[in-house]
């Protein structure tokens, strides 16, 4: 069936255009030659003016942005929600781990509290900060924990006769901690497990946050003028001929969209790789690569490390007695 | 003998956490996220098609608009942009992505590289030197509960289970913060903790 003849008065076009732009000044009363048009180039008289064309272009680009936003809405929500949930979950794990460790000290080594609570608190603060991307070195955190704990263990449990707050011997004890390997291989074990599990956790969160950034970027893309022209021709130029109910051809729409989105579609290759790499990472997040597993068991490893010190207590006290004799004499003087 | 935190531990020899059958864990939540993400793996390549299917396009009509005129839906002219002199579609593609898109591609390349570096090579997860350094006894098979760095007096087994969603809403705290009293119960070898809702500093 042939199309209806174009409206001789542009009346229909006016009522359509009024929805986009209240105020009718821009729509001609009757079809005009349209020699000033740049996008909707007419084959005959047209009901469009240059100003209308500009408005159509603006509307077309806005439509496109809205379509893009609705396309990504579900994906965006999925990643944003999960990033928040995992971040909070990791914080809860850290808090539990801290509580378990404090409880272990309180029940097994009450003489080491409250100093132990302070060191444990600081250690887990750094764990949290590290997960959130802070530039802290895991080995430094673990070393600091054992360096801080040993003087307290020595002065409170192994040699409780020493006067309190013996500063000079603390220097010596901190040094002895590493020189004599007083905790055996436990600090090294904790370093390995904590650094591996936290690295993976941190990159997992970083990846989710980057996912949000990728979607946000495409969500707020501003389309080029060329794209705006193509969209206008596809969606609105038919109006100029009074063809209000006609829809664009499917194949034509695909061609236009591919043109408009040529740049965006280039993300595809890297996006696929991103999801597959993230899957690979997640598949490997168990045992020492699972922070939940490692951190919630840390209290036990720390407990074992202190037991190790106690087991070797006699030997250690003698060695440290000699090594730090100078410091101890000064204190008793 | 040692006292252990919470109701997690019953006896140092077993130290098993009660396992709630379908309880949601962090690892199951992670796997679920990946499955959902994989359904969006073609998101970017499918965008042009998605937008066309969500904007007015002639589906059942015999005639459609090709940018210049009304044509039959299945004619050669339907897929082709009639206005050849206007500007070239090929040119538009040749311009390359916008700077903001190039930037995001660079960031994706970087994170992909990091993810690949961090991914645990299959079969290497149980690297003895790392996973069990300093451990003296007990065998932790793949199907068993996780083993955590432990001592000679029995493997410490902890089922890797955070009651994930419940924890988020109602979360156990033993912090030395006001209102959080911690009671050592010598008789039962456990600690009872008053719970507090929300995040304590």
């Amino acid at each position: 069936q042939p199309p209806p003849p174009p409206d001789a008065t542009c009346h229909q076009v006016r009522s359509f255009f009024q929805r986009l732009q209240p105020g009718l000044k821009w729509v001609p009363e009757t079809p005009v030659p349209g020699s000033d048009l740049q996008v909707c180039l007419p084959k005959g008289p047209t009901c469009c003016s240059r100003k209308m064309e500009e408005k159509y272009q603006l509307t077309a680009r806005l439509n496109m942005e809205q379509l893009l936003q609705s396309a990504s809405m579900e994906l965006k929500f999925l990643i944003i929600q999960n990033a928040a949930v995992f971040q909070e979950a990791f914080e809860i794990v850290v808090r539990h781990a801290k509580n378990y460790t404090n409880a272990m000290f309180k029940n097994n080594y009450p003489s080491l509290t409250p100093q132990a609570f302070e060191f444990v608190g600081e250690f887990f603060t750094d764990v949290s900060l590290y997960i959130l991307g802070s530039d802290i070195n895991v080995d430094d955190m673990v070393n600091e924990l054992f360096d801080s704990l040993f003087p307290v263990i020595y002065t409170q449990m192994m040699n409780p006769g020493l006067p309190e707050s013996v500063l000079d011997i603390n220097e010596c004890l901190r040094g002895a901690r590493r020189d004599l390997k007083v905790f055996g291989s436990f600090p090294k074990l904790i370093m390995t497990q904590v650094s591996k599990s936290l690295q993976v956790t941190r990159i997992f969160l970083q990846a989710l946050n980057l996912g949000i950034e990728v979607i946000n970027t495409t969500d707020h893309l501003k389309f080029s003028k060329d794209c705006g022209r193509m969209l206008t021709r596809m969606w609105y130029c038919s109006y100029c001929q009074g063809l209000m109910m006609v829809k664009p051809c499917g194949g034509y729409c695909n061609v236009v969209m591919q043109g408009c989105m040529a740049g965006v579609v280039e993300i595809d290759k890297y996006w696929r790789e991103y999801i597959l790499s993230l899957e690979e990472l997640v598949n490997g997040m168990y045992r020492i690569y699972d922070m939940e597993n490692v951190l919630l068991g840390l209290f036990s490893t720390i407990h074992d490390s202190i037991q190790y010190v106690q087991k070797n207590g006699g030997k250690l006290t003698t060695t440290i007695g000699k090594l730090c004799a100078h410091s101890q004499q000064r204190q008793y003087r | 003998s040692a006292y252990y935190p919470e109701d997690l531990f019953i006896d140092k020899k077993i130290l098993k956490v009660a396992h709630v059958e379908h309880e949601e864990t962090l690892s199951s939540r992670r796997r679920e996220l990946i499955q959902k993400l994989k359904s969006f793996i073609n998101f970017y390549s499918a965008l042009p098609g998605y937008i066309c299917s969500h904007s007015p396009v002639a589906e059942n009509d015999t005639l459609c608009w090709n940018g210049q005129e009304l044509v039959e839906r299945y004619s050669q002219k339907a897929a082709r942009n009639g206005m050849k002199n206007q500007f070239n579609l090929h040119e538009l593609k040749m311009k390359g992505p916008e700077p903001v898109v190039s930037q995001i591609i660079d960031k994706l390349k970087h994170i992909n590289q990091l993810l690949r570096t961090m991914s645990v090579p299959k079969g290497k997860v149980l690297d003895k030197s790392l996973d069990e350094e300093g451990l003296e006894s007990g065998d932790c098979g793949d199907d068993e509960d996780e083993c955590i760095g432990s001592s000679g007096d029995g493997m410490v087994k902890v089922k890797n289970q955070l009651r994930f969603l419940a924890e988020l809403a109602y979360d156990l705290d033993v912090d030395d913060a006001p209102g959080n009293k911690q009671h050592g119960n010598q008789k039962d070898n456990e600690i009872t903790t008053s719970h507090s809702v929300g995040n304590m500093p």
Epitope: T125, D126, N137, D140, E144, E171, R174, R177 | P201
Partner: antibody, heavy 120, light 112 residues
């Protein structure tokens, strides 16, 4: 007892680099971090950076491109170096031992200071 | 960076008097872990600074108990209950809650 002794030239030209050595005694560099701070009439006290017991470093972001802190544990020495010093880098430079917990710590013992004038 | 503002710039006192120095930070020094990393140093004339008080109110080893620190959030105070001659010099507050560490401009405690 704990001591930090500094040594370095008092006068530096902009074309040279500013180098100061901090030699410590009474404690081991394998168990304590050492910070660097400077004091000038115009800017007051300004934290420059730290080297931890592991050898890892943290720097003030404003100066990161010009600073380098290294150490030799066996000699108990920490080396501070600033490239392309300008006139407004003239100050008294101090090294100090880290007390407390890593970057949330404080300087519990200080060196005697090295007065540096940058002049062409 | 966190700006630390000390008042007064100069504090003339008589020996035996009480002295009070104020330090204000441009943002809260309360860390997410519940601790506040605000410290006080004293620099006597021609010498290096010495640590007096760490984490708001903890006296460093060997510091007399006439020195006390208090405050929270962004407002902190150092009090000297009875000023002695060896207390004269410039007092600095410093924070390590946020990186980089920053210092106050100093308060000079001098004899009236």
């Amino acid at each position: 007892q704990v001591q930090l002794k500094q040594s370095g030239p008092g006068l530096v030209q902009p074309s040279q680099s500013l180098s100061i050595t901090c030699t410590v005694s009474g404690f081991s560099l394998t168990s304590y971090g050492v910070h660097w701070v400077r004091q000038s009439p115009g800017k007051g006290l300004e934290w420059l950076g730290v080297i931890w017991s592991s050898g890892n470093t943290d720097y003030n972001a404003v100066l990161i491109s010009r600073l380098s802190i290294k150490k030799d544990d066996s000699k108990s020495q920490v080396f501070f170096k600033m490239n392309s010093p300008q006139v407004d880098d003239s100050a008294i430079y101090y090294c100090g031992r880290n007390g407390g917990w890593l970057l949330r710590g404080f300087m519990d013992f200080w060196g005697q200071g090295t007065s540096v004038t940058v002049s062409s | 960076d966190v700006v630390m503002t000390q008042t007064p710039l100069s504090l003339p006192v008589s020996l035996g008097d009480q002295a009070s120095i104020s330090c204000r930070s441009s943002q809260s020094l309360l860390h997410s872990n519940g601790n506040t990393y605000l410290h006080w140093y004293l620099q006597r004339s021609g010498q290096s600074p010495n640590l007096l008080i760490y984490k708001v109110s903890n006296r460093f080893s060997g510091v007399p108990d006439r020195f006390s620190g208090g405050g929270s959030g962004t407002d902190f105070t150092l009090k000297i209950s009875r000023v002695e001659a060896e207390d004269l010099g410039i007092y600095f507050c410093s924070q390590s809650t946020h990186v980089p560490w920053t210092f106050g401009g100093g308060t000079k405690l001098e004899i009236k």
